[in-house]
Structure formats: C-alpha cells, structure tokens
C-alpha cells in the first residue's frame, strides 16, 4: 500500500537525496554522506 511504501512526509522509501556539500575548513567536503538514502 502507499503508506507502506512511503516515508511519513511523502518521500518514497529508498529515494536518494542530495545534500549540498559542506566545506567547513574551505577545502575538503565534510558532508556525512555524499548521497544518503531516505528511510
């Protein structure tokens, strides 16, 4: 059913999200996950 397959805010389970990369010290990306899954 829809409720079983979708996250409570309506985003499909397993759909990738793409956070903006974080550069707290200017150079390296310190994002926790590059392309985390939404569960």
């Amino acid at each position: 059913s829809y409720s079983m397959e979708h996250f409570r805010w309506g985003k499909p389970v397993g759909k990738k999200r793409r956070p903006v990369k974080v550069y707290p010290n200017g150079a390296e990306d310190e994002s926790a996950e590059a392309f985390p899954l939404e569960f």
């Epitope: 805010w9 793409r18 903006v20 550069y23 200017g26």
Partner: antibody, heavy 113, light 110 residues
Framework: QQLEESGGGLVKPGGTLTLTCTAS?????????ICWARQGPGKGLEWIGC???????TYYASWAKGRFTMSRTSSTTVTLQVTSLTAADTATYFC???????WGPGTLVTVSS | DIVMTQTPASVSEPVGGTVTIKCQAS??????LAWYQQKPGQPPKLLIY???KLTSGVSSRFKGGGTGTQFTLTISDLECADAATYYC????????????FGGGTEVVVK
C-alpha cells in the same frame, strides 16, 4: 581560496544578464558545489541553486526554474544567466562554495528602466 | 519545498547577555542545518554546520543545537561585535528544493 562575482549593473526590465563567479586559490575541476544566492535591498537571503562543477549537474530552487541557468564555463568560472528580468530581481547576487564561509563579496544587479 | 521559519525577527540584549534564536523546518531535515552571521555590506560567514558543529575560528560562545525540525542558535556573553543578522539554512536536499534560508534575525547589542 576566494570567489568573486562580476557582471552586475543596471539592466532594463525584460532584459537578460549573465553573472560570472571566478575562483582563485582552487579549481572547479575537483567537483565542488558552487551555489548562488541573492539578497534584495534590506531583505533576507534567498537560495537560487547550485551546480556540481564535476558532473555539471544543476539544481534550482522551484521559483528559479526556467529563468535562471547555471553553467561551468572553465576550470575557474561558473556563470548564472537570468532572463526576463523584473524589478523584483534587483538584488546583490552572491556565489558561494557549498556550505562554507567562502562567499564572494557580491555583485549588485539593478533592474530599472 | 522546505520552509524555514526563524524567530524572533529582531532581538536586543545588553553586552554580556544571552540570545537564543529559533529555526523551525517544515519537514525533517535531520541535522543538515547551518547558521550564518552577516554584517552590513558583507557576505554571510558560516558559524555552525551540521546543526551543532562549530566552524574553525568561531568563538565557542556560539552554540547550535537541535535535530529533525527544531533548531536553536545561542549566543552567550554577548559582545558588541556580535551585532549582526543571523540566518539559518538547510542544505538537506538540492534535488527537492531543500536548501532554503530562514528569514533572518537581527541581533542588537545594547
């Protein structure tokens, strides 16, 4: 590492403008997120979108889709083209390296006849 | 679209005081939240990322907290140099327009 915007100025309503974000001290070849935001006079910050300079993938705020186009034009430059300009587009436009303190000083765009 | 609601719009406190700014997301954003300080005529400066991590070189008087939809920025032992406008921003998802700024909070130091 620094960023600097250029290309701002006075534009007539309905016109098109291309802003350039130039990097110094680093290259876009590594695949950084370069993002654009704007700030109207006396107003808050508004996110426009980001470009992944490695893949060339672009991501826009819903309100910016259609009139705004971001491109990587060289290893040190990214452009933002804005079409069908109106007075509501009058703002200081900033480019930034993802989420960081590396922001350009901004370039002022004034849309007026 | 993710909406970031920031309160208050303006706050005034004396030197040495404490200010707390709140930011509420319209949906969960995990800990993908940044806080910026902006002074007139300058670009924003990143203070905090990942909701609570302090950027290198930023005073420990700035403290971020929260997760999910409710976040706070607390500035303690206020100094005159803290007078600025502060913005929260989520960077949760650039695919689905999840990168919006809060409306800003002007901090006046008396």
């Amino acid at each position: 590492q620094q960023l600097e915007e250029s290309g701002g100025g006075l534009v007539k309503p309905g016109g098109t403008l291309t802003l350039t974000c130039t990097a110094s001290g680093f290259s876009f070849s590594s695949g950084y997120d370069i993002c654009w935001a704007r700030q109207g006079p006396g107003k808050g910050l508004e996110w426009i979108g980001c470009i992944d300079t490695g893949s060339g993938n672009t991501y826009y705020a819903s309100w910016a889709k259609g009139r705004f186009t971001m491109s990587r034009t060289s290893s040190t430059t990214v452009t933002l083209q804005v079409t069908s300009l109106t007075a509501a587009d009058t703002a200081t436009y900033f480019c930034a390296k993802g989420i960081s303190s590396i922001w350009g000083p901004g370039t002022l765009v004034t849309v007026s006849s | 679209d993710i909406v970031m609601t920031q309160t208050p719009a303006s706050v005034s406190e004396p030197v040495g005081g404490t200010v707390t700014i709140k930011c509420q997301a319209s949906q969960t954003i995990s800990s993908d939240l940044a806080w910026y300080q902006q002074k007139p005529g300058q670009p924003p400066k990143l203070l905090i990322y990942a909701a609570s991590k302090l950027t290198s070189g930023v005073s420990s008087r700035f403290k971020g907290g929260g997760t999910g939809t409710q976040f706070t920025l607390t500035i303690s032992d206020l100094e005159c140099a803290d007078a600025a406008t502060y913005y929260c921003q989520t960077y949760y998802d650039i695919i689905d327009d999840g990168c919006t700024f809060g409306g800003g909070t002007e901090v006046v130091v008396k």
